[in-house]
Interface confidence: medium
């Protein structure tokens, strides 16, 4: 086993150079020292290692670090960062935004989304901010990842990105998320008036309170239903018919098509059936005539 | 892009009749929500009625109710707004719009017909 072997004598090298590519992994295994590969990382970049002595590199790296690089050395890392998995950086204390940045460059079109994710969510975790040079050097990763950081990473993520939010980048957040999220875009967008403001907002509206949409309705956003099905069913319930018509607009006309799916369904069952009738729109679903809820999930008939 | 143009406006007294029509032209408008709107004079622009791009759902102002009838051929790319028992205060230039998403972006809008109750 290559673990048993000691280094053949004269073989120990003082550096990173050439000569240790005609190595045989056995040897780099026996011989390198993980400490001097981390002062000299640069020659390791430099120098046409094959891919299984980079790999050999790096177990020494592992073994000399185990709980996870020093920032030293990550700030030199620059594409050896390819061959180190999400689950390392996770281990990782990054603070500089400057080391973000280099590796993110590294890292483009390297197919190394989950890397780079886990790098920012490492930084942010240190206490770094995201500011939107970061969000370019993530390139073409869409922001979904937004969803992968941690609510307390999500607190370190300034406003500013906000802008920066795309319709489907949302779409696998949960709850708590979108709620954290929401709040962030309501400060991002606070300068912004009228329905340029509403077309702004309308990504995040899933994290929305009753209480918002209840603000919201008073604007005439004519919100479509693409939109309104996306809002969280807790807050969509204490909408009133006459709430709900005026956050929709026209766009009501479109509640018939989503009455037996979900959010839809949820909202027409806790409303009174003659005051859906008033919509002429055909809904069904409410409660009916003469009933009574007593309970938030039960209906009583009058007795 | 879509262009949308109004016709069938005019003068008719209380208690009348007038079918407005609205022809699309530029590309086809069979996948729009189509509605109309109206503007009187020194009011806001307040919804009529709405028919979804199916043609199977409608949407009418309580003012309009059992009077207004809204309609679409989307092979002719046209919506229609059949008016009857008009009043006076169904006088307003009428406005037809087109919408894929929310009426608040990618609105296309007509220039408008005027039409006029006289008691």
């Known amino acids: 086993d290559a673990e048993q072997k000691a280094c053949p004598p004269g073989k120990e090298p003082y550096k990173v150079d050439e000569d240790l590519i005609f190595y045989q992994n056995w040897e780099l295994e026996a011989c390198v020292d993980g400490t001097m590969l981390a002062r000299q990382m640069d020659l390791v970049n430099e120098i046409p290692f094959t891919y299984e002595q980079l790999s050999i590199f790096k177990h020494k790296l592992d073994k000399t670090y185990p709980q996870g690089y020093p920032e030293s050395l990550i700030q030199q890392l620059g594409h050896f960062f390819r061959y180190v998995s999400p689950e390392d950086i996770h281990q990782w204390n990054v603070t500089s935004p400057d080391t973000v940045k280099t590796l993110l460059k590294v890292s483009k079109g390297q197919k190394m989304n989950a890397q780079a994710i886990a790098l920012v969510a490492c930084y942010l975790r240190g206490g770094g901010q995201l500011d939107e040079d970061m969000v370019k050097a993530l390139g073409d990763i869409p922001l979904s990842y937004l969803c992968d950081f941690s609510p307390q990473d999500l607190h370190s993520v300034p406003s500013s990105v906000m802008w920066l939010v795309g319709p489907q980048d949302l779409d696998k957040c949960s709850q708590r998320h979108l709620g954290l999220l929401y709040q962030k875009a309501c400060s991002a967008f606070q300068n912004v008036s009228g329905l340029e403001y509403f077309e702004k907002i309308k990504t995040f509206l899933g994290g929305a309170s009753v209480k918002d949409l209840r603000a919201l309705s008073q604007h005439n956003v004519s919100m479509d239903i693409a939109t309104f099905k996306r809002l969280q069913v807790d807050s969509l319930v204490g909408l009133s018919v006459a709430e709900v018509q005026k956050l929709l607009g026209p766009n009501i006309v479109d509640l018939k098509t989503e009455e037996d799916k979900s959010p839809v369904r949820d909202w027409l069952f806790r409303q009174h059936q003659k005051d859906l009738d008033r919509l002429g729109l055909g809904l069904q679903g409410g409660i009916p005539n003469g009933y009574l809820v007593l309970d938030f999930n039960v209906r009583e008939a009058f007795s | 892009q879509v262009q949308l143009v109004e016709s069938g406006g005019g003068l008719v007294q209380a208690g009348g009749s007038l079918r407005l029509s609205c022809a699309a032209s530029g590309r086809t408008v069979s996948t729009y929500n189509m509605a109309w709107f109206r503007q009187a004079p020194g009011k806001e622009r307040e919804i009529v009625a709405v028919?979804?791009?199916?043609?199977?759902?409608?949407y009418y102002a309580e003012s309009v109710k059992g009077r207004f009838t809204i309609s679409r051929d989307n092979p002719k790319n046209t919506v229609y707004l059949q008016m009857n028992s008009l009043k006076p205060e169904d006088t307003a230039v009428y406005y037809c719009?087109?919408?894929?998403?929310?009426?608040?972006?990618?609105?296309?809008w007509g220039q408008g017909t005027q039409v006029t109750v006289s008691s």
């Open positions: 028919i979804n791009w199916t043609g199977g759902s409608t």
């Open positions: 719009a087109a919408t894929r998403t929310s009426w608040t972006e990618n609105t296309y």
